[in-house]
């Protein structure tokens, strides 16, 4: 669980991180996904990229560089406001779309220099470039000119991928993998845990048969399922104990002030 900020050391450049978990080492966890994430490096005092396996790990893990900096670098938000007023687009906003490698099928956003708008694309989870944002808002904030009005989000197909047989270009298939729907999943306000614990079991895309466990948010228990070896989602654990340890903590009965990341 994350802790309240210690405001005794909130000056920029202070060596003490805002939260104790910011001092933890990057932990990729035991699973096989390859999700680009960020952690605060105590030794360089910077937020740095690492590849997260998709399950377990620790709280020193952030989906975006911005989120990492805001959480772990004392006084960062004050300096960020100053920088934003300069309104200059970073170079990476002009990089071409790069879906990367692997089979994460993650919904991401990039800045399209032709249309001057932030658009949706599908990211595989490995490699890729920095023109890759978790949210449309973040993309707009960093790369879109503030004078532009909100724009429609365009789907981008994954024709850049070489797959084992068929190229994934069917949008509905991609969307099914990215946002699996399940009537049994409780509303988000009932569960404050890791978002992938809400996803249904997904056996993936390959031919293997590996025994795995997934968290069933309706029953609050971890159940066995067969995993085919690639693809799928992050609700996928090698043992029941790991599954429970990662997902059980998010139930609403948790009375801590902190938010489970």
């Amino acid at each position: 669980l994350s802790e309240e900020a210690d405001d005794t050391d909130s000056e920029l450049g202070s060596m003490k991180p805002l939260h104790t978990f910011c001092a933890m080492k990057a932990d990729d966890g035991p699973c096989k996904a390859m999700i680009r994430s960020y952690f605060f490096n105590m030794y360089t005092h910077q937020c740095e990229e690492f590849i997260y396996g998709g399950c377990e790990g620790n709280e020193n893990r952030f989906d975006t560089l911005e989120e990492c900096k805001k959480t772990c670098i004392p006084g960062y938000e004050k300096t960020a406001v100053k920088a934003a007023s300069g309104a200059e687009r970073p170079d990476f906003c002009f990089l071409e779309e790069d879906p990367g490698l692997c089979r994460g099928y993650m919904k991401r956003y990039l800045y399209n220099n032709q249309t001057k708008q932030c658009e949706r694309f599908v990211y595989g989870g490995c490699l890729g470039n920095r023109n890759n944002f978790e949210t449309l808002d973040e993309c707009k904030k960093i790369c879109e000119n503030p004078v532009h009005s909100p724009s429609p989000v365009n789907e981008v197909q994954m024709s850049d991928y070489v797959t084992d047989g068929n190229t994934v270009t069917d949008r509905s298939t991609v969307n099914n993998i990215v946002v699996p729907q399940s009537p049994k999943v409780p509303r988000r306000r009932d569960y404050r845990g890791r978002p992938w614990c809400l996803q249904p079991a997904d056996s993936g895309l390959c031919k293997a048969s590996e025994r795995r466990f997934y968290y069933n948010s309706a029953t609050g228990k971890c159940h066995r399922f067969n995993y085919t070896g690639c693809g799928g989602n992050n609700n996928n654990f090698t043992t029941r104990r790991r599954c429970l340890r990662s997902c059980k903590t998010g139930l609403i009965k948790n009375k801590s002030k902190g938010v489970v990341k």
Partner: antibody, heavy 117, light 108 residues
Framework: QVQLVESGGGLVQPGGSLRLSCAAS???????GSWVRQAPGKGLEWVSV????????YYADSVKGRFTISRDNSKNTLYLQMNSLRAEDTAVYYC???????????WGQGTLVTVSS | DIELTQPPSVSVAPGQTARISCSGD??????VHWYQQKPGQAPVLVIH???NRPSGIPERFSGSNSGNTATLTISGTQAEDEADYYC??????????FGGGTKLTVLG
């Protein structure tokens, strides 16, 4: 027939430069592409990788700052510009197509680069 | 960074089963791919994603990945299987990593 053909290898002096090319035929080379090398009598060593659009490039520590990977999709060709060459860069250089699942599914026949005075 | 370790050589009689290991930290959490390389030729992918065989690769080639070791198994080994075999994986720190290679000798 899907194939990759490397060219541009040869003998070069230490400190010299060489540019390797890899022409793809039988398919549109719009996916990630990579260079892998093999020193005489040794194992395989990954050198560099580039994304389909060319916007992302990654290098092994041993070549970072000296080698540059690039591509020309209109020519269906991958390149490796090698500068400040050293004796330890002597190897057969293979170009390969990178599959989404992070393996190399199509390889060229290789081109020999010899760095010697 | 991951380091993949293979035995330098493995010998097998024709018709017998050859097993080539590839070990490394947390290897079950990574996908492992295998390549065959004959003298003077480019490598050829024989197994990808731990245990998937590309089309054109004989059924006698199979793979597994558990414990701290990934294994390439060639059942009913034939003389033409004599070659060097390399395992490979993708790692966040060093990207594409190869094992040192194993020379498979088919006796007789």
């Amino acid at each position: 027939q899907v194939q990759l053909v490397e060219s541009g290898g040869g003998l070069v002096q230490p400190g010299g430069s060489l540019r390797l090319s890899c022409a793809a035929s039988g398919f549109t080379f719009s996916s990630y592409g990579s260079w892998v090398r093999q020193a005489p009598g040794k194992g395989l060593e990954w050198v560099s990788v580039i994304s389909g659009s060319g916007s992302s490039t990654y290098y092994a520590d041993s070549v970072k700052g000296r080698f540059t990977i690039s591509r020309d999709n209109s020519k269906n060709t991958l390149y490796l510009q090698m500068n400040s060459l050293r004796a330890e860069d002597t190897a057969v250089y293979y170009c390969a197509r990178v599959n989404i699942s992070t393996h190399f599914d199509v390889w060229g026949q290789g081109t020999l680069v010899t760095v010697s005075s | 960074d991951i380091e993949l370790t293979q035995p330098p050589s493995v010998s097998v009689a024709p018709g017998q089963t050859a097993r080539i290991s590839c070990s490394g930290d947390n290897i079950p959490e990574k996908y492992v791919h295998w390549y065959q390389q004959k003298p003077g030729q480019a490598p050829v992918l024989v197994i990808h994603g731990d245990n998937n065989r590309p089309s054109g690769i004989p059924e006698r080639f199979s793979g597994s990945n558990s414990g701290n070791t990934a294994t390439l198994t060639i059942s009913g080994t034939q003389a033409e299987d004599e070659a060097d075999y390399y395992c490979q994986s993708f790692d966040a720190g060093s990207y594409f990593v190869f094992g040192g290679g194993t020379k498979l000798t088919v006796l007789g």
